[in-house]
């Protein structure tokens, strides 16, 4: 859950409690089980480049 008082994440990104920051939803293509990916499910990802494990 996002910490109180922090700004909401911008479009195409989602909050990660594991990393304590907003993460680009395109990163879910590299690691689909990242915690922030649940918040990306409804939003289209940003353009992406190479994907690694």
């Amino acid at each position: 859950e996002q910490a109180p008082g922090t700004a909401p994440c911008s479009r195409g990104s989602s909050w990660s409690a594991d990393l304590d920051k907003c993460m680009d939803c395109a990163s879910c293509r590299a690691r689909p089980h990242s915690d922030f990916c649940l918040g990306c499910a409804a939003a289209p990802p940003a353009p992406f480049r190479l994907l690694w494990p």
Epitope: A17, L19, M23, D24, S27, A30, L50, L51, W52, P53
Partner: antibody, heavy 120, light 112 residues
């Protein structure tokens, strides 16, 4: 360049604990996950768990919950794994590995491995 | 947990000849985003594992193009078009679909 350098071999008696380290360089420590993998003699690879160094949040394999404890020291860019209540079955090479969560990642990096021998 | 099963256990090869290794997953690794989260690693004797293939068919940086990988959601094949002496070692398939991260049992490739 990215490097993960692990601590040296350890010989321990049954029941003892051991703490092995993985010092990273060449990238921002808090930006990537550090995973730990076990390889028993002549056996395959087995994921133990992983840590997000920036927050200290951890995920463990059920098999290693209570056996392994993962920590990270941001000030020294070093990840640690402590194994408790050692038994002969814990004799293995243990690897740390950098895992990504990003889409613009340039490679897959592993430490050189740390051999832990449990013997009375 | 996703179980990864490899065959054969051991593969004697002749330099210059092709070789292939099979891997099967107990659950489809094809995600709804269209990506198949299957990876191949090679562990050369006395070394740490190194990534060969990511997301089923993409060659990792620096990996020779004699390596290729294909498959469906659950059945995968790693092919070496012409085996070289430096290709010996243990090959592992793995997934990155979810936790826990699991590996196949390995296939030992050795020169005949």
């Amino acid at each position: 360049q990215v490097q993960l350098v692990q601590s040296g071999a350890e010989v321990k008696k049954p029941g003892a604990s051991v703490k092995i380290s993985c010092k990273v360089s060449g990238y921002t420590f808090t930006d990537f996950i550090i995973a730990w993998v076990k390889q028993a003699p002549g056996k395959g690879l087995e994921w133990i768990g992983e840590i997000y160094p920036g927050t200290g949040r951890t995920y463990y394999s059920e098999k290693f919950r209570g056996k392994a404890t993962l920590t990270a020291d941001k000030s020294t860019s070093t990840a640690y794994m402590e194994l408790s209540s050692l038994r002969s079955e814990d004799t293995a090479v243990y690897y740390c590995a950098r895992r990504t969560i990003y889409y613009d990642y340039d490679g897959d990096y592993w430490g050189q491995g740390t051999t832990v021998t449990v013997s009375s | 947990d996703i179980v990864m099963t490899q065959s054969p256990l051991s593969l004697p090869v002749t330099p210059g000849e092709p070789a292939s290794i099979s891997c099967r997953s107990s659950k489809s690794l094809l995600h709804s985003n269209g990506i198949t989260y299957l990876y191949w690693y090679l562990q050369k004797p006395g070394q740490s594992p190194q990534l060969l293939i990511y997301q089923m068919s993409n060659l990792a940086s620096g990996v020779p193009d004699r390596f290729s990988s294909s498959g469906s959601g659950t059945d995968f094949t790693l092919k070496i078009s012409r085996v070289e002496a430096e290709d010996v070692g243990v090959y592992y398939c793995a997934h990155n679909l979810e936790l826990p991260w699991t590996f196949g049992g390995g296939t030992k490739v050795e020169i005949k």
